[in-house]
């Protein structure tokens, strides 16, 4: 189930600026995600949050090549993995002064994927052969999901996929960015 | 491994609408790309809108447009394709598909048993 | 809208090799049409073969192959046997939207 199918051989990372010197011990965790060891950057005020009672979670970014066999994309492709641990955003770092700080007890929250999009990659093989084009995808956006004493572990091995996407037909979410549009993005980052 | 199961055989009249839906086990409806197929007797596969993950929305084809409206219950993991003023012309066998999961996109992979609807005064 | 193209039927012997197309209205068909092919027989639902132009499936036959062949998408089939007689179809995508092909009968004769 969920992501079990994941193929994916790719281990060249392309570090991005200010990124963690290793992954936090959650992603360690998310072998069947990706296969990286190493990589993403600092979230962006992860723990800031208009409405107190919302759970946070961090998203991190690295920039890797994705690889299907002996094929290698053209371009790297910046994904994004769900991290952290989950606690009411009013209690999360900003309240450590306060002796708040939150510990989990009863309900389980986990920082899971929310939405999924899709990139094209354009595959480069070795011996002359043809390029391939694949469509890869990715985690668009995390969230906390609660998870009670009755979800089995196969959900957190396979990202809590009980993860909800809008009803398309009536709030599509935002369009994706296109793989151009990342690419010059990535070009620009370096 | 993904499994659709979709519902049961409909008889209309023109004019009316039809609402099929087809139930995901194996993976939830979220992490799927679903796509709706129909096939009129004895013709070819007509593909009539589905979900592109690319651009993250619900594309429909042109011919429907108006017509047909995909939905998704994520709390069910069940997907709805309704079509609307219902012509003798409709009368065809839908299907549901999806991708397989995982890491590469692969759309089409899992097919519902299809469902038959019959559009007759 | 685009239009796809296959030849409507096709016979191949018994052991034989047979090639089925599959273009477009708008030109040359190309690995960023994504070329997919899916076999049907009758009173079953349609079984996809080939994804991306070439990527088979674990339940897909070794003798069914995917190109690109003559600004057109390709599905071989080498060494056939009675059981690939069946309606095959081909889809493209363009952009998000996919269109099939009227589908080839492929008869094993």
């Known amino acids: 189930q969920g992501w079990q199918a994941f193929k994916n051989d790719a281990t060249e990372i392309i570090p991005e600026l200010g990124e963690y010197p290793e992954p936090p011990p959650e992603l360690e965790n998310n072998k069947t995600m990706n296969r990286a060891e190493n990589g993403g950057r600092p979230p962006h005020h992860p723990f800031e949050t208009k409405d107190v009672s919302e759970y946070s979670c961090r998203e991190l970014h690295f920039t890797r090549y994705v690889t299907d066999g002996p094929c290698r994309s053209a371009k790297p492709v910046t994904e994004l993995v769900c991290s952290g641990q989950c606690g009411p955003a009013r209690l999360l770092p900003n309240a450590i002064g306060r002796g708040k700080w939150w510990r989990p007890s009863g309900p389980d929250f986990r920082c899971i994927p929310d939405r999924y999009r899709a990139q094209r990659v354009q595959l480069l093989c070795p011996g002359g052969e043809a390029p391939r084009a694949r469509k890869v995808r990715l985690v668009a956006s995390c969230k906390c999901k609660r998870l009670t004493r009755f979800h089995n572990q196969s959900e957190l091995k396979d990202f809590g996929t009980e993860a909800a996407r809008p009803q398309k037909g009536r709030k599509p979410r935002p369009r994706a960015r296109s793989a151009k549009a990342n690419q010059a993005e990535l070009e620009n980052a370096y | 491994e993904v499994q659709l199961v979709q519902s049961g055989a409909e008889v209309k009249k023109p004019g009316a609408s039809v609402k099929v839906s087809c139930k995901v086990s194996?993976?939830?409806?979220?992490?799927?790309?679903m796509h709706w197929v129909r096939q009129a007797p004895g013709k070819g596969l007509e593909w009539m809108g589905g979900?592109?993950?690319?651009?993250?929305?619900?594309i429909y084809a042109q011919k429907f447009q108006g017509r047909v409206t995909m939905t998704e219950d994520t709390s069910t993991d069940t997907a709805y394709m309704e079509l609307s003023s219902l012509r003798s012309e409709d009368t065809a066998v839908y299907y549901c598909?999806?991708?397989?999961?995982?890491?590469?996109?692969?759309?089409?992979?899992?097919w519902g048993q299809g469902t038959l609807v019959t559009v007759s005064s | 809208q685009a239009v796809v193209t296959q030849e409507p039927s096709l016979t191949v012997s018994p052991g034989g090799t047979v090639t089925l197309t599959c273009g477009s209205s708008?030109?040359?068909?190309?690995?960023?049409?994504?070329p997919y092919w899916f076999q049907q027989k009758p009173g079953q639902a349609p079984r996809t073969l080939i994804s991306?132009?070439?990527d088979k499936h674990s339940w897909t036959p070794a003798r069914f192959s995917g190109s690109l062949l003559g600004g057109k998408a390709a599905l071989t089939l080498s060494g056939a046997q009675p059981e690939d007689e069946a309606e095959y179809y081909c889809?493209?995508?363009?952009?998000?939207?996919?269109?099939f092909g009227g589908g080839t009968k492929l008869t094993v004769l």
């Open positions: 598909a999806t991708d397989a999961g995982g890491y590469w996109y692969k759309f089409f992979q899992h």
């Open positions: 194996g993976y939830t409806l979220s992490e799927l790309s």
């Open positions: 979900f592109d993950p690319e651009g993250g929305e619900t």
């Open positions: 708008t030109g040359t068909v190309t690995i960023d049409h994504y």
């Open positions: 991306d132009t070439d």
């Open positions: 889809l493209l995508f363009y952009g998000g939207t996919v269109v």
